[in-house]
């Protein structure tokens, strides 16, 4: 912490102004006014002060307001915001778009930090849900936002905030993510027609139960593979032969060359091997021809 | 433009482990399988096995069970191959390659990353 | 496993002439699954040709490709400096998936 010193005469700081950058860290302390630092917020970010200069300035602000800045000064902390701990921001109350928008520029290009995952918490929590704006701006800085959520965080996404959502943002979601996001994906798109409707859903079809998949099949959407390989194992399994081709369309000739990876794997174990040897794809390891199928599951749940 | 970049030479003693990183870059990642291809001195191909982005399930070939392991994060778009009780017989050039979900063959291929096992 | 076995091994050719290469596989496959690729020295492999007779983007109309169960063939109609290279056949149609040993293509 700076030691409190008397502001040397003719040093006094009448207006946050390039001056500064030649002030010891011990007169910034001494000369700057807190109050003038806060109105003046804007032009610091114009000014290239120091690291130890910007710790001065924080120290200030710190002091002024010691339950959280307000958001007037937040919108314009600029390069100040990375001094920023997660409990200096916890204090915070920021309910504007802009000073979301402004704080996570300074960010730009970098991995999220604690920093920002604790403001756009805040944000978030502050609004109640993740509104359609909120969710465009933060899927455009961060496309992997969205499942960096948990199911229970996504849970309070609206279905109107899904129109937002880009293929990409979905990328690394996980299976009990989609679970989640599916069925307001299904309630968002509901009013569009079979091809729109596939396009906009494709993305979500991860949380997709096998009635979805079943309807989907008498669409000619012509599924590809690589958004067949993301459904669920246990949606795929209880589909037919005839479903699946006709789910993939001219794409069901892609089964041959993930045979062995799931969901076709599991799935191909329990077709007909008659069944499977109609497409004509050299498909392999299905239930051979005379075989009768027992399903396990259920004569357990009796016994 | 596609890209599978390959971590450069690696010369490792017998019995030690090696991990090769495959840093994909101008797709989507997790719509293609990486497959991994072993040459040695400049001759034929084998294919060692693939995984798969979405599920992390591997497939391998059987000549390569017990010897490779391959991953994936698809956090960074990276594919590893780690392979272990290193011997004389895996120095060799071994590739990454791409191949698109549902579709044979391999459309990109990283530049190749050289093992020497020696003492 | 399947077997692919390429012939000839090593063989040189002058600028316009005709080269066949050939690719045995030790069963019958669903020709979809047969590939060709093309490897210069010092680079990595690069798909040529896919389903026995497509040609991968960028390849020249001169190269061809057919075939069908246990016997296929890649064809250069017009020997060109630039088509110096090993080509390997491959086969996705069973596990595990395999390549033959080659054909280094020379020029005269």
């Known amino acids: 912490e700076v030691e409190k010193t008397a502001c040397p005469s003719g040093k006094k700081a009448r207006e946050i102004d390039e001056s500064l950058i030649f002030y010891k860290k011990w007169e910034l302390e001494a000369c700057v006014d807190a109050a003038l630092l806060a109105t003046q917020m804007d032009r610091v970010n114009a000014i290239p002060f120091t690291y130890e200069q910007l710790d001065v300035l924080k120290h200030k602000l710190d002091e002024l307001y010691p339950q959280g800045y307000p958001e007037s000064v937040i919108q314009h902390l600029g390069y100040l915001f990375l001094k920023m701990s997660p409990e200096d921001i916890r204090k915070w109350n920021v309910t504007s778009l802009e000073t979301l928008k402004a704080l996570l520029e300074v960010n730009k290009g970098h991995e999220m930090s604690p920093q920002v995952a604790t403001l756009i918490d805040r944000f978030v929590k502050g609004r109640g849900q993740l509104d359609k704006d909120t969710l465009d701006t933060l899927t455009a800085f961060y496309p992997g936002y969205l499942c960096s959520l948990s199911p229970e965080e996504l849970s309070s996404v609206p279905p109107s905030s899904i129109w937002a959502v880009r293929p990409q943002d979905l990328d690394t979601c996980d299976p009990r993510q989609l679970d989640v996001l599916y069925p307001k994906a299904r309630l968002a798109f509901q009013n569009m027609n079979g091809s729109e409707y596939f396009v906009k859903i494709q993305s979500f079809l991860g949380g997709a139960p096998t009635e979805d998949l079943k309807a989907l099949s008498q669409q000619n959407v012509s599924m590809d593979l690589a958004t067949f390989m993301k459904l669920r194992t246990d949606a795929v399994l209880p589909l037919t032969v005839a479903e699946v081709q006709k789910l993939l369309g001219p794409h069901v000739e892609g089964l041959k060359a993930e045979e062995r990876h799931r969901p076709v794997r599991d799935w191909i174990l329990r077709q007909r091997q008659d069944d499977l040897d109609t497409l004509g794809l050299g498909l392999q390891g299905g239930i051979p021809n005379g075989y009768l199928v027992l399903d396990l599951s259920m004569q357990e749940a009796l016994s | 433009d596609v890209q599978l970049q390959q971590s450069g030479p690696e010369l490792v003693e017998p019995g030690a482990s090696v991990r090769i990183p495959c840093k994909a870059a101008g797709h989507t990642f997790t719509d293609y399988n990486v497959d991994w291809v072993k040459q040695s001195h400049g001759q034929s191909l084998e294919w060692i096995g693939d995984?798969?982005?979405?599920?992390?399930?591997?497939i391998y070939n059987q000549k390569f069970e017990g010897k490779a392991t391959l991953t994936v994060d698809t956090s960074s778009s990276t594919a590893y191959m780690e392979l272990r009780s290193l011997t004389s017989e895996d120095t060799a050039v071994y590739f990454c390659?791409?191949?698109?979900?549902?579709?044979?063959?391999?459309?990109?291929w990283g530049q190749g990353t050289t093992l020497t096992v020696s003492s | 496993q399947v077997v692919l076995t390429q012939s000839p091994a090593i063989m040189s050719a002058s600028p316009g002439e005709k080269v066949t290469l050939t690719c045995g596989a030790s069963s019958s496959l669903i020709s979809k699954y047969l590939y060709w690729y093309q490897q210069k020295p010092g680079s990595s492999p690069k798909l040529w040709i896919y389903s026995t007779s497509n040609l991968a983007s960028g390849v020249p109309a001169r190269f061809s490709g057919s075939g069908s169960g246990t016997s296929y063939s890649l064809t250069i109609s017009s020997m060109e400096a630039e088509d110096a290279a090993s080509y390997f056949c491959h086969q996705w149609s069973s596990y595990p998936y395999t390549f033959g040993g080659g054909t280094k293509v020379e020029i005269k």
């Open positions: 390659a791409r191949r698109r979900l549902g579709q044979g063959g391999f459309d990109s």
């Open positions: 995984v798969n982005p979405n599920t992390d399930g591997a």
